[in-house]
């Protein structure tokens, strides 16, 4: 079950809930946003203060890391299994250092299996964080410091830090280095969403959340 099911079962308060893998008894803890846009959102990524190191291995990105109450990555395997069961939407919420907020909403999102390197698939972009997708289209394979699947002769994950669906290296990386205010410009290895803030701006906060399309 996901946060949408938790919501429908009557739990309408934001917080950490125990979710289960589809067709399994395996459990995972996730933060559920039960207020934004009608609730039922499963938070799959959050950056807010630089407290967690996002330069992690393939296995760590697979199973997840961090703390669901703060900065964390839910885990590619859970997200892949979940998003292949039914149609999901992905909402990415962004904050800059000047008090502005923006979002990108994809009407269809899923990750391929690990055998296909958790390739990201996205359709139907709307929102205020750019008219062009800052996640390269068509989607790329996921890359980490020990799993180089990008389209660059270089190793984007090693160079820019963090696991992401790098292209060569692509217009985004929400898992890059966290830079504090006044150190967040001209940083090509920061938390980047190109079609909102440009090539060298490192964001203050990001949240990636998913919910069934028919919620």
């Amino acid at each position: 079950r996901d946060c949408a099911e938790v919501f429908k079962s009557g739990h309408t308060t934001n917080g950490i809930y125990t979710l289960t893998f589809p067709n399994s008894t395996e459990e995972i803890k996730a933060y559920c946003d039960m207020e934004a846009g009608g609730g039922g959102w499963t938070i799959i990524q959050r950056r807010e203060d630089g407290s967690v190191d996002f330069q992690r291995t393939w296995k760590e990105y697979k199973v997840g890391f961090g703390n669901p109450s703060g900065e964390y990555w839910l885990g590619n395997e859970f997200v892949s299994q979940l998003t292949n069961q039914q149609r999901y939407v992905l909402k990415i919420h962004l904050k800059d250092w000047e008090g502005n907020e923006a979002y990108s909403l994809y009407e269809h999102f899923y990750l391929s299996s690990e055998e296909l390197n958790y390739r990201i698939h996205l359709k139907g972009l709307t929102g205020t964080a750019g008219k062009i997708s800052s996640i390269s289209q068509p989607g790329n394979d996921f890359s980490t410091k020990d799993g180089d699947n990008d389209k660059c002769i270089c190793k984007c994950s090693q160079m820019l830090t963090g696991g992401w669906w790098f292209d060569a290296c692509g217009p985004s990386n929400l898992n890059g280095m966290y830079y504090p205010q006044r150190q967040n410009t001209n940083k090509f290895n920061g938390i980047k969403w190109y079609y909102w803030k440009g090539s060298g701006y490192s964001l203050k906060a990001t949240t990636m959340m998913i919910r069934p399309a028919d919620f």
Epitope: C154, A168, K187
Partner: antibody
Framework: EVQLLESGGGLVQPGGSLRLSCAAS????????MSWVRQAPGKGLEWVSV????????YYADSVKGRFTISRDNSKNTLYLQLNSLRAEDTAVYYC???????????????WGQGTLVTVSS | DIQMTQSPSSVSASVGDRVTITCRAS??????LAWYQQKPGKAPKLLIY???SLQSGVPSRFSGSGSGTDFTLTISTLQPEDFATYYC?????????FGGGTKVEIK
């Protein structure tokens, strides 16, 4: 095989203009930032300009700012450099350069053209 | 602008020698440095990027190290085809600047 073929160099008088072109092949041109680097005769390398994948971001060395303009046409796989108000000190071999990545704020050149010579003299 | 200072400006060496070239940045550039090789009349060739990452197809006798302001390019066993001029370049901030070059000559 990556190929970058420059053209448009030549002899021009001080104050004159030239347009350099660079035809790219062997890679997905629209996915990479592109640069121009120059080298005066017998001297070292000097970075001139870089352009983002979409062409929306351009940056220049102070020595050419306001006089040179970098642009690209992704439909033609071609990079350009418009040189105006040329000076004697602009005399150099101009190299078209493919960046390693698409990150315009971090230029590493992994492929270079053969260079085209621009001579500014009266 | 960040100044890049290479030393020595030239070095005479024999085939089989170990050659070390240094590059110093006028301010901290983290690990955002490249090394290029250039032969007379030819375009430069990327050897190393991000201070120590070996570019695809470059022989493993070339290695790079350093971070911050001090960087080194090492050729472990000099080969006849390695006689050339070597340049460092900072990729940390605009404008991107090159060192003055180090010419590796036959002793």
């Amino acid at each position: 095989e990556v190929q970058l073929l420059e053209s448009g160099g030549g002899l021009v008088q001080p104050g004159g203009s030239l347009r350099l072109s660079c035809a790219a092949s062997g890679f997905t041109f629209r996915k990479y930032a592109m640069s121009w680097v120059r080298q005066a005769p017998g001297k070292g390398l000097e970075w001139v300009s870089v352009i983002s994948v979409s062409g929306g971001n351009t940056y220049y060395a102070d020595s050419v700012k306001g006089r040179f303009t970098i642009s690209r046409d992704n439909s033609k796989n071609t990079l350009y450099l418009q040189l105006n108000s040329l000076r004697a000190e602009d005399t150099a071999v101009y190299y078209c350069a493919k960046d390693l990545t698409d990150i315009v704020l971090m230029v590493y050149v992994d492929y270079w053209g053969q260079g085209t010579l621009v001579t500014v003299s009266s | 602008d960040i100044q890049m200072t290479q030393s020595p400006s030239s070095v005479s060496a024999s085939v089989g020698d170990r050659v070390t070239i240094t590059c110093r940045a006028s301010q901290d550039i983290d690990r955002w440095l490249a090394w290029y090789q250039q032969k007379p009349g030819k375009a430069p060739k990327l050897l190393i990027y991000a201070a120590s990452s070996l570019q695809s197809g470059v022989p493993s006798r070339f290695s790079g190290s350093g971070s911050g302001t001090d960087f080194t390019l090492t050729i472990s066993t000099l080969q006849p085809e390695d006689f050339a001029t070597y340049y460092c370049q900072q990729a940390n901030s605009l404008p991107f600047t090159f060192g003055g070059g180090t010419k590796v000559e036959i002793k």
